[in-house]
């Protein structure tokens, strides 16, 4: 029997330092995990301790934190060097900052094979691009070879910006020649390493022949065995064991987000290749395990140029950014029609001709936004005066509701309305009308939604049946503020963009903003 | 060195049951599935059905659903197949064999269980 | 079901001689073919797996070939210990199935 150690990450997303528990920005650093300098120490403890290691990304390192907004890409390249990576899959925020986001900061640069069997390139950018990532990659590993094949989630056109030169196939589809050929140039042993989501993490092992060992990403999925260190809760045992359709017993794993954990599988392998058993948990990489000090203090080298970022005018704004809690938790508020705005403008992708957008709506708890911005100063708006209006380290993710589930978030919104409290939604592709003279639970007395499926925008009647997309703060998918109804009856949930990035590169782009109160949230009654 | 152990002839009568005994050795038995191979005399070889001892998962050909029931003990490493309702054409040589996923080959069979049905 | 079939059930060949025993399927099974000999005691033991991957301490004299739906052992330089019944088995698809046999004889 051969014996090999997978470690493994995925959706990083720009957590270069360590962070607080929550993957927020660390404040007591006793307290603090996770950071590719803690990452690196206990890489190297196993690698020192275990013969045949690999050390895997299951893709998402792009976005987060200003790391990202800054270096574009850059820092991924350079620590993931560092670490030695021995591969990555592609995920879908690696192609945020469009193709050539990709390939000058991390494909050219990258000492490690980055994959994707079931990207295809097309046009012009076919030659570009060849030979920067590949579909799969013949790793030797002590005596033996490894094969690894990649894949990428099929909706990243919806999700990010790859352009219209790269095609995204169907994972099985394209995973399963791959592999084949793998088979014949007689590699025994393959790992599927993607970005797909913990679904598709599954079905890639019921459904592709000769993958015997799943590594994935995108759904942040927490497995473990036994009781769990930290705050997360699994949603399976470590490895979690897929039968495949001709019978294989096959490991699927993930290892949560934000760098929070290693992933830590051990497989032994017989001669022909079975995997013969497969174990281990991922490992929280909590304060007990020292950052390393070279590593360490390189991140302090390249933090100077964040400090520095902070201060710069990102954009101006003529009006008074209102994002008081007087304002945001009781009406609308500019400073929520901006951030929504904002939202809807990321996620502007014309993939379709008979629609202007994929989506349309966006929903924000007015408690998440925490300060007003000043325009009495020259009008300049800075990350750091964002960092105030949204110090949470959010995203804004993107999800499928019913418009029964969005009903229900709209009566949440108002259902104790007066009492200052977070829950009461800031919106934009919506009007609300609100009658607070009804009892909780039936004061939303209309509710238009902004079609997607016409050449001219227009509002329409929400419908209870039809699905939606929405965009809005991971917060609220995850059921925060008490909309538990998004989390338990949401149909899909991508995760999206760095709150704070999504709202600055809005403003450079506008250059100068003035939002306006525009009649989105209405009272039928009352003096509002 | 890998090795099947199968249980010694048996001879039944019609509608009675017989419950055969397959002994591995030399390997990690919880890990690999142990298949299930009928030959009736002077004929091919077909396969019954598979048992995977790990987690007890078990397939059955169409033919042998009812007919075969497929168990394993793993702290003796040993499967077994029970074959119920007895006929005569259930009068055959029974092996089991090991399963390689890799290729879906059976790499190491057990010298066969001689099934003898008569009144 | 995918239906193996070995159409040669029986065949003579001298010792020293090249001999070729072929199977087909019903459907293309992506070269996953196994090939097993029976010894007239009972004995079955894994030729070749995958095609033309020879198991383990089976002697070079043995090889397969094929693809799609045909396929075939070769068995280079015949030796009297080579006297058997040989099977192929599909390992594409559930249920596995086995050719019906090819019984070699000495001439």
């Known amino acids: 029997a051969w014996e090999l150690t997978i470690l493994h990450t995925n959706d990083v997303h720009s957590r270069l330092e360590q962070t607080s528990e929550d993957s927020s920005k660390c404040v007591n650093a006793s307290r603090c995990m996770g950071g590719v300098a803690r990452l690196f120490t206990k890489v190297q403890q196993i690698r020192r301790a275990e013969p045949n290691v690999l050390l895997l990304d299951a893709g998402d390192q792009y976005q987060g934190t200003i790391w990202f907004t800054v270096y574009k890409g850059a820092e991924v390249a350079h620590f993931m060097n560092a670490l030695r990576y021995d591969a990555m899959a592609l995920g879908n925020h690696e192609f945020d900052n469009g193709v050539e986001g990709l390939i000058e900061p991390l494909l050219k640069e990258a000492k490690f094979p980055i994959l994707s069997a079931n990207i295809k390139a097309k046009g012009p950018l076919a030659s570009q691009i060849s030979g920067l990532y590949l579909p799969y990659k013949v790793l030797p590993v002590g005596d033996e070879v490894v094969g690894i094949v990649g894949y990428t989630s099929k909706e990243t056109p919806f999700l990010s910006n790859p352009g219209t030169n790269l095609v995204f196939e169907d994972e099985i589809t394209a995973l399963q020649p791959e592999v084949d050929k793998l088979k014949t140039l007689n590699v025994n042993k393959i790992i599927a390493l993607g970005h797909s989501g913990f679904e598709m993490d599954k079905l890639i092992a019921q459904k592709v022949r000769g993958v015997d060992v799943v590594v994935g990403g995108h759904s942040n999925t927490f497995l473990y065995t036994g009781n769990p260190p930290s705050k997360e809760v699994p949603a399976g045992k470590y490895p979690f064991i897929v039968t495949s359709d001709d019978g294989r017993k096959v490991p699927v794993v993930q290892a949560y987000a934000f760098g929070k954990y290693l992933g830590y599988l051990k497989i032994e392998f017989d001669e022909r290749g079975n995997v013969i058993s497969s174990h281990g948990n991922p490992i929280l990489l909590n304060s007990s395990i020292p950052e390393d000090p070279s590593i360490k203090a390189d991140i302090n080298k390249w933090r100077i140029k964040l400090d520095n970022y902070s201060t710069q005018e990102l954009g101006k704004t003529i009006v008074y950014l209102d994002g008081s809690s007087q304002s945001c938790r009781f009406r609308e508020c500019n400073m929520g029609n901006l951030i929504c705005d904002a939202m809807i403008n990321n996620n502007l992708r014309h993939t379709d001709e008979m629609f202007w957008n994929h989506v349309s709506m966006c929903i924000l708890n007015g408690g998440g936004i925490r300060s007003p911005i000043d325009e009495r100063n020259n009008g300049t708006i800075t990350w750091e005066n964002l960092a105030a209006v949204l110090p949470f380290g959010g995203t804004f993710d993107l999800v499928q509701l019913k418009g029964s589930t969005l009903k229900k978030a709209f009566e949440h919104s108002v259902h104790r309305y007066g009492q200052s409290t977070g829950e009461f939604l800031q919106v934009g592709g919506i009007h609300v009308v609100y009658d607070l003279s009804r009892k909780p639970g039936d004061r939303v007395v209309k509710l238009d939604v902004l079609c997607t499926k016409c050449r001219v925008p227009s509002y329409d009647p929400l419908k209870m049946d039809e699905v939606y997309k929405v965009i809005l703060p991971n917060f609220l998918a995850n059921g925060g503020d008490g909309f538990q109804m998004i989390k338990d009856e949401l149909l899909r949930h991508d995760s999206g963009d760095q709150d704070i990035n999504v709202v600055s590169t809005y403003i450079s782009k506008m250059k100068v903003i003035y939002p306006a109160v525009e009649g989105r949230i209405k009272f039928s009654t009352g003096s509002h | 060195q890998v090795h099947l152990q199968q249980s010694g002839a048996e001879l039944a009568r019609p509608g009675a049951s017989v419950k055969l005994s397959c002994k591995a050795s030399?390997?990690?038995?919880?890990?690999?599935?142990m298949e299930w191979v009928k030959q009736r005399p002077g004929q091919g070889l077909e396969w019954i059905g598979a048992?995977?001892?790990?987690?007890?998962?078990?397939r059955y050909t169409q033919e042998f659903k009812g007919k075969a029931t497929l168990t394993a003990d793993e702290s003796s490493s040993t499967a077994y197949m029970q074959l119920s309702s007895l006929a005569s054409e259930d009068s055959a040589v029974y092996y089991c064999?090991?399963?390689?996923?890799?290729?879906?080959?059976?790499?190491?069979w057990g010298a066969g269980t001689t099934v003898t049905v008569s009144s | 079901d995918i239906q193996m079939t070995q159409t040669t059930s029986s065949l003579s060949a001298s010792l020293g001689d090249r001999v070729t025993i072929s199977c087909r399927a019903s459907?293309?099974?992506?070269?996953?073919l196994n090939w097993y000999q029976q010894k007239p005691d009972g004995t079955v033991k894994l030729l070749i797996h995958?095609?033309?991957r020879l198991h383990s301490g089976v002697p070079s004299r043995f090889s397969g070939s094929g693809s799609g739906t045909d396929y075939s052992l070769t068995i280079s330089n015949l030796e009297q210990e080579d006297i058997a019944t040989y099977f192929c088995?599909?390992?594409?698809?559930?249920?596995?199935?086995f050719g019906g046999g090819t019984k070699l004889e000495i001439k």
């Open positions: 088995q599909q390992g594409n698809t559930l249920p596995w199935t």
């Open positions: 064999a090991r399963g390689n996923w890799d290729d879906w080959d059976f790499d190491v």
């Open positions: 459907q293309d099974i992506s070269n996953y």
């Open positions: 048992i995977y001892p790990g987690d007890g998962d078990t």
């Open positions: 995958y095609t033309s």
């Open positions: 030399g390997y990690s038995f919880i890990s690999y599935w």
